[in-house]
Interface confidence: low
């Protein structure tokens, strides 16, 4: 480590005198720079000594000196102060930056030691420190404000009392940079925007920044434009805003217009599209197939989405039938607005009930005409059986009865015994037959089909099961013969399959 | 009492550099807390501030001109000089250098021009 | 860079007017503003430093009022010789900055 002679750590001279410091270290050994001009460097063997013949009160600072060989990095430091009367500061720097919550040094250095208890901080022209400004003082190194804010960015002057009175050194500018988080906040307004061709518009893209260092544009595709700017401040940050207003526009005006705001810590950028029409439209479309299947006392949405310009001046949900001349309940019908062209209309049907199947509409209305787009609503039911005991041409014969929606099929089933329905184990015959004739089929309605089962006697001990299915359920409906007689067997005619 | 002159070429050709010369009288730049600025002024157009030197050597510039500007000085002859590289016809203007000061203890610095010379007219034209 | 905008750019008033010029800053200054005067063919002349102090020698009917971003020049009764143009300076911040002007003329 070097060795300073003399030693210190502190050596008070008056002004005028000589002042030599002398650094010797094991090897070659350098002053910290910069030097000022009032000294004199010289090498004197493995010593480096500094040296001036008129010390001034600028000479008054923290002198250090290194050993660049020194693996442990060492140093030795001396500070100066050379008393002058008339001078009790000796400022190095007339502005000081720093960031916000940062500590301040106000480097302003007391030429006399002895002065250091009449010490203070002022603000320029002797106007007291803020409230809350937390200092210290340091005779080496100057004045501290600890984590300096954004409004202690001021002219400070440093006081001393000499002689019973006080006397300050020349101002020193402190500046107090807010901490930027990140590029500017945008907002473009509107995020979206159609016209029709002729009409006005206006597009404003506004951007704010914790600070007043920030720029703002606003681009056409790739054209930046040349827009008067309007800044404001308020809630604590830079308001910037840009401003397009169109008194007529054209198809030129149409595309892609983003807002560009940067700052030291970079770009931030937000975009819309502008579209321009030849004149007003309305659209409506489903996600949903218009064509709808729902199971009875089940519920159903139906969704219609809407793009139009201008906005719509009325819409409704219709029923038209064919069952009830009933309307939609209007706490049912919800719109939701997707953005300024798009919107969402849901009709709720809960709890279907069988007089509610049929044709919904949606109409929608605008400057542009009327559109609706209608939704078919078919309720689905599982089927219902009944068979009764009829003669057929001299014939004896069961005649099933299935109603339900999709249209059920049919399957016979012989058991043995008396039973409410036949289980497998029962189970001695089983007939399926492919075309049930279809009584009724309307639309919106369930559909009725018949199968017949011709028998020439039936037994007693034995039941006869007419089941049908479809895709929401089955039912079935058991006979049983009152008197003994033949087995019964299929006719020829019915195609059965075993 | 304060005096400032300035002095320099009357005319200059586009791209060619311009040396201009402020000498003072009646205080010194090694003063604490003197300084000297320059200031130039279109005909017919506002004052324009380009560029402050300290007493200790403290240099400021204004940065729209700061790549084409020099100041320095030179304190045993009382002078402050001026260079602009790269002069313009839009650089055409009288050219003023003005003392900022002095420091009166125990008040508070002057940072402002409180004494000016009577300006140079530089033309620049080819 | 601050932009100190004055106002109004030229004034017509007669001797014993009085006249107020303004100028306004992007941002806060904090006083550090001076006034001068300039008559054609002149250097400018320091009036005001501080916003609000008289430099030494300068008539008592020239006063600057003002704080944050807005700033006053007053001439309380306006004299022949008061005819000229006036410039506002801030130095605040680098780039010291000079407001447009105000040219005060007779009526």
């Known amino acids: 480590i070097p060795v300073i002679e003399p030693s210190g750590p502190e050596l008070v001279v008056k002004p005028g005198e000589t002042v030599t410091l002398r650094c010797v270290g094991n090897g070659s050994v350098e002053w910290d720079g910069p030097i000022s001009p009032h000294w004199t460097l010289y090498s004197d063997g493995p010593s480096s000594v500094l040296t001036t013949n008129n010390a001034t009160f600028q000479n008054t600072r923290t002198y250090r000196c290194t050993e660049p060989g020194d693996p442990l990095g060492g140093s030795a430091a001396i500070h100066l102060y050379v008393k002058d009367p008339a001078r009790p500061w000796n400022v190095l720097a007339k502005e000081v930056v720093v960031f916000e919550d940062q500590d301040a040094l106000l480097p302003c250095l007391l030429t006399d030691p002895v002065l250091e208890a009449g010490v203070s901080l002022v603000r320029l022209r002797g106007r007291p420190l803020l409230r809350h400004t937390n200092y210290s003082f340091s005779p080496w190194h100057g004045f501290i404000i600890h984590r300096a804010k954004f409004i202690q960015g001021q002219d400070y002057q440093c006081s001393a009392l000499m002689g019973g009175r006080k006397v300050m050194s020349i101002s020193i500018r402190l500046k107090v940079q807010k901490v930027i988080p990140g590029p500017p906040a945008l907002t473009l307004v509107p995020a979206e925007l159609v016209r029709i061709r002729g009409e006005a518009a206006q597009i404003v893209c506004s951007a704010s920044n914790i600070d007043v260092d920030f720029d703002v544009f606003l681009q056409h595709n790739t054209t930046k434009l040349a827009i008067p700017q309007r800044s404001d401040f308020h809630d604590n940050r830079y308001q910037k805003v840009l401003t397009l207003s169109l008194g007529q526009v054209d198809f030129q005006h149409a595309g892609n217009y983003s807002c560009v705001a940067s700052n030291v810590q970079g770009k931030h950028s937000t975009s819309m599209f502008f579209q321009v029409v030849e004149s007003a439209y309305l659209d409506l479309s489903s996600e949903q197939n218009l064509i709808q299947e729902v199971t009875v006392g089940e519920g159903l949405n139906l969704k219609v989405m809407v793009e139009a310009y201008p906005g719509l001046q009325g819409f409704n949900w219709t029923y038209l039938g064919p069952f009830s001349d009933h309307q939609p309940e209007p706490k049912l019908a919800n719109a939701t607005t997707k953005d300024t062209y798009r919107h969402t209309f849901t009709l709720s049907l809960p709890r279907l009930k069988p007089s509610e199947a049929g044709r919904y509409s949606f109409l929608a209305r605008n400057p542009g005409g009327w559109r609706a787009l209608t939704f078919e609503l078919t309720l689905r039911y599982p089927p219902e059986v009944s068979v009764i005991w009829t003669s057929i041409n001299g014939s004896g014969t069961l005649l099933c009865a299935a109603s339900g929606y999709p249209q059920p099929n049919v399957t016979w089933l012989q058991c043995a015994g008396h039973t409410d329905r036949c289980d497998e184990a029962q189970v001695l015959q089983v007939w399926v037959d492919p075309h049930p004739e279809v009584l009724s089929q309307e639309p919106f309605q369930k559909v009725t089909v018949q199968s017949l089962l011709t028998a020439e006697t039936l037994e007693h001990n034995q039941t006869y099961e007419c089941r049908a299915h479809n895709s929401v359920g089955s039912g079935s409906w058991a006979f049983i013969p009152i008197s003994a007689g033949a087995r019964t067997h299929p006719p020829d005619e019915f195609l059965f399959t075993p | 009492e304060v005096t400032l002159k300035e002095s320099g070429p009357a005319l200059v050709k586009p791209t060619q550099t311009l040396t201009l010369t402020c000498t003072f009288s009646?205080?010194?730049?090694?003063?604490?807390?003197?300084?000297v600025g320059w200031i130039r002024q279109p005909p017919g157009k506002a004052l324009e501030w380009l560029a402050n030197?300290?007493?200790?050597?403290?240099?400021y510039y204004n940065p729209s001109l700061k790549n084409r500007l020099t100041i320095s000085k030179d304190t045993s002859k009382n002078q402050v000089v001026l260079t602009m590289t790269n002069m313009d016809p839009v650089d055409t203007a009288t050219y003023y250098c003005a003392r900022i000061g002095p420091i009166k203890y125990p008040t508070a610095p002057y940072r402002y021009f409180d004494f000016w010379g009577q300006g140079t007219m530089v033309t620049v034209s080819s | 860079d601050i932009q100190m905008t004055q106002s109004p750019s030229s004034l017509s008033a007669s001797v014993g007017d009085r006249v107020t010029i303004t100028c306004l800053a992007s941002?806060?200054?904090?006083?550090?503003l001076a006034w001068y005067q300039q008559k054609p063919g002149k250097a400018p002349k320091l009036l005001i430093y501080?916003?609000?102090s008289l430099q030494d020698g300068v008539p008592s009917r020239f006063s600057g009022s003002g704080s944050g971003t807005d700033y006053t020049l007053t001439i309380s009764s306006l004299q022949p010789e008061d005819f000229a143009t006036y410039y506002c300076?801030?130095?605040?911040?680098?780039?010291?900055?000079f407001g447009g002007g105000t040219k005060v003329e007779i009526k």
């Open positions: 501080y916003a609000s």
């Open positions: 941002e806060d200054i904090y006083d550090n």
């Open positions: 030197i300290w007493w200790d050597d403290d240099k």
């Open positions: 009646g205080f010194s730049l090694t003063t604490y807390g003197m300084g």
């Open positions: 300076l801030q130095d605040s911040e680098y780039p010291w900055t």
